[in-house]
Amino acid sequence: PGPPAGSPRVSSDPRADLDSAVLLTRSLLADTRQLAAQMRDKFPADGDHSLDSLPTLAMSAGTLGSLQLPGVLTRLRVDLMSYLRHVQWLRRAGGPSLKTLEPELGALQARLERLLRRLQLLMSRLALPQAAPDQPVIPLGPPASAWGSIRAAHAILGGLHLTLDWAVRGLLLLKTRL
């Protein structure tokens, strides 16, 4: 009769699993885009913002030719775990100004956690090692000011959007190579 409902499949089509990861990544990309736009409307950004604790971009036009599934999934998972930490930190330490975005930040965190679980499942199905982050985890202190938390939010959402954008492209490309 097959495995009981809700139990993980023992064997699975990696392309279908990757498809599912692409759909979740696209969905999170759309959510992040929407939230970043909301942030810009409520708190217009004066120029560009960056945070030293955010991961550096892993993909570009130059890396697409040499992409391999293990490396992409491992790096994506590590980077998204870092972004998850930053979103959690924003929700905890962002101050009153960011409380107006709390429902959206909460939903974004839940989606990010869901995507991370999906990537972990995909990696275990492909028998890839669940690598720990290479870079040391930088402790995130409280923002210097209310404006500091807003600048941090712009940087986090902008960086996450860019990471997810490349992730969709990379995963689509890898699907064709499976």
């Epitope: 560009d48 971009l57 036009a61 130059g62 902008g158 960086g159 959007h161 860019l162 954008d165 689509l172």
Partner: antibody, heavy 117, light 110 residues
């Protein structure tokens, strides 16, 4: 607000050279791959090439290989297109555009290059 | 001759729904994301749809994209006079190792 501003276009003779610039503002320039595209008068869009965010990788359309070179200076937030051995068919409006993945999410207003004797 | 094929023109009356097609091959549309750009007369192109069906912020949801196999389409519902423009589809091409475009479709609002 993201802004891309091209400059350096003008009239040049066949076989001549020209260098276009694209000044970027309103975003972290060093995080984004950048492209040049072009549009001949009354014609469609054509991709010229892309340079990776750190500047070490470049890809070009076949029609410009060996004649055009894309470079960038991240300290100046500027993208360049060096065009050599220009031909009449290179006459077009040249656009710079930002790439966050597979698409061009912001474009400059364009600069016209006319190759004619 | 463009790598991606679009009808040169399309038209509709205000309020109508119009669809623009874009066909390619497995090396471009079949394996890669499709993007759509709108170019209003005398202006630079603007991103309209990315990753087949996602809308950038600021683009009204009257615009929608879809993809099936090696073809894609752009639909505009509730057509308005300000939608009169050229529309281009685009995708990465694995064989050419570069970005390819359709020839563009001139949309006229009657």
């Amino acid at each position: 607000e993201v802004q891309l501003l091209e400059s350096g276009g003008g009239l040049v003779q066949p076989g001549g050279s020209l260098r276009l610039s694209c000044a970027a503002s309103g975003f972290t320039f060093s995080h984004y791959d950048m492209n040049w595209l072009r549009q001949a008068p009354g014609k469609g869009l054509e991709w010229v090439g892309v340079i990776s965010y750190e500047g070490s990788n470049k890809f070009y359309a076949d029609f410009v290989k060996g004649r055009f070179t894309i470079s960038r200076d991240n300290s100046k937030n500027t993208l360049y297109l060096q065009m050599n051995s220009l031909r009449a068919e290179d006459t077009a409006v040249y656009y710079c555009a930002r790439t966050p993945g597979s698409h061009f999410d912001y474009w400059g207003q364009g600069t016209l290059v006319t190759v004619s004797s | 001759q463009s790598v991606l094929t679009q009808p040169p023109s399309a038209s509709g009356t205000p309020g109508q729904r119009v669809t623009i097609s874009c066909s390619g091959s497995s090396s471009n549309i079949g394996n890669n994301a499709v993007n759509w750009y709108q170019q209003l007369p005398g202006t630079a192109p603007k991103l309209l749809i990315y990753y087949d069906d996602l809308l950038p912020s600021g683009v009204p949801d009257r615009f929608s994209g879809s993809k099936s196999g090696t073809s894609a389409s752009l639909a505009i519902s509730g057509l308005r006079s300000e939608d009169e423009a050229d529309y281009y589809c685009s995708a990465w091409d694995d064989s050419l190792n570069g970005v390819v475009f359709g020839g563009g479709t001139k949309l006229t609002v009657l």
